[in-house]
Interface confidence: medium
């Protein structure tokens, strides 16, 4: 969805895209409350067995301008000695999110939601062992 | 982020932040294309050593109007034996999303952005063990 | 494949009444909300009314609020908009479309039907 300011220096636009009489303004609210803005950040990534790491994934025509995105440390599942397990595999899980990007080349102040799909995190999972026929 | 319409019923923003007053295109991009849409549920909330359920979220006023919401199964997590271990943990990896939500209904035409918090999936750590001063 | 086709359109002396139709295919009708959509000459696109997947709730427009009427027939797979007390700035082509939450898109529109109210 592009959200465009109503603006005399950006043209109007006729498409069938846009309604007239819907209009946002960007504040944006926590439906939870204190519940999401003040979580400490979680240390699961690394006292996971499925490890992972963060990487920052910024953009400042976006928001959230900052994304952290998980990718799996290893390929296989840390077990209790500290060892990889060859018949586990750590996989990451990834969930579609909704991000707000500005379009710079149109007109100033010119967004859209886009889906992006991200890592959140890594588990551990028995691997799928192929029979042979 | 509210969506405000153009009508006397509903608020009139006339403040000077014109981020506040801007029009909305109807169409929602993929910024990885058919990689979102196309993507099969993966299997791994059965096949993990810390499983999960999912249990639909509906609402229609919002946007999305499903979100499917991951819950542990176990508190503890499964070992190569299908058994719990109980000196490890299932926990809870969870994300903050945006979604677009309906204003009450008296302003049907007027939407918000909103944080929500939801869980994805769940991974297995070590217990932490508290040693006795 | 989804459908949506209107009907009902047409030439109207202010003050007169229009019933449009939309008959919609290709898709489980009863689990989506429908829209009213139109779109005046030269004019951007309005959002008129919508109703919710069992009929119980209704959203309109000020502009058109008592004058318009939403209404579905899940078993018909039909949506219908009555028109009364015209008046000439609700001449445009009339929409229907099936979506989520309206703001972010229509997963589908008809043709549009022209509604003209003219003395």
């Known amino acids: 969805a592009a959200i465009i300011p109503q603006s005399s220096a950006c043209p109007n636009t006729e498409a069938k895209d846009f309604l007239q009489n819907v209009k946002v303004n960007l504040k944006v609210f926590n439906s939870l409350g204190a519940k999401v803005s003040s979580r400490r950040p979680s240390d699961y990534l690394n006292r996971s067995t499925s490890p992972w790491t963060l990487h920052r994934n910024e953009d400042p025509d976006r928001y959230p301008s900052v994304i952290w995105e998980a990718q799996c440390r290893h390929q296989r599942c840390v077990n209790a000695e500290g060892k990889l397990d060859h018949h586990m595999n750590s996989v990451l899980i990834q969930q579609e999110i909704l991000v707000l990007k500005r379009e710079p080349e149109s007109c100033p102040f010119t967004f859209r939601v886009e889906k992006m799909l991200v890592g959140v995190g890594c588990t551990c999972v028995a691997s799928i062992v192929r029979q042979a026929a | 982020a509210a969506i405000i319409p153009q009508s006397s019923a509903c608020p009139n923003t006339e403040a000077k932040d014109f981020l506040q007053n801007v029009k909305v295109n109807l169409k929602v991009f993929n910024s990885l294309g058919a990689k979102v849409s196309s993507r099969r549920p993966s299997d791994y909330l059965n096949r993990s050593t810390s499983p999960w359920t999912l249990h639909r979220n509906e609402d229609p006023d919002r946007y999305p109007s499903v979100i499917w919401e991951a819950q542990c199964r176990h508190q503890r997590c499964v070992n190569a034996e299908g058994k719990l271990d109980h000196h490890m943990n299932s926990v809870l990896i969870q994300q903050e999303i945006l979604v677009l939500k309906r204003e009450p209904e008296s302003c049907p035409f007027t939407f918000r952005v909103e944080k929500m918090l939801v869980g994805v999936g769940c991974t297995c750590v070590a217990s932490i063990v508290r040693q006795a001063a | 494949e989804v459908q949506l086709v209107e009907s009902g359109g047409g030439l109207v002396q202010p003050g007169g009444s229009l019933r449009l139709s939309c008959a919609a295919s290709?898709?489980?009708?009863?689990?989506?909300?429908m829209y009213w959509v139109r779109q005046a000459p030269g004019k951007g696109l309005e959002w008129v009314a919508e109703?919710?997947?069992?009929?119980?709730?209704?959203y309109y427009v000020d502009s058109v609020k008592g004058r318009f009427t939403i209404s579905r027939d899940n078993a018909k797979n039909s949506l219908y908009l009555q028109m009364n007390s015209l008046r000439a700035e609700d001449t445009a082509v009339y929409y229907c479309?099936?979506?989520?939450?309206?703001?972010?898109?229509?997963?589908?529109w008809g043709q549009g039907t022209l509604v003209t109210v003219s003395s």
């Open positions: 479309a099936k979506g989520e939450i309206l703001p972010l898109y229509f997963d589908y």
């Open positions: 290709g898709f489980t009708f009863s689990s989506y909300s």
């Open positions: 109703i919710k997947q069992d009929g119980s709730v209704q």
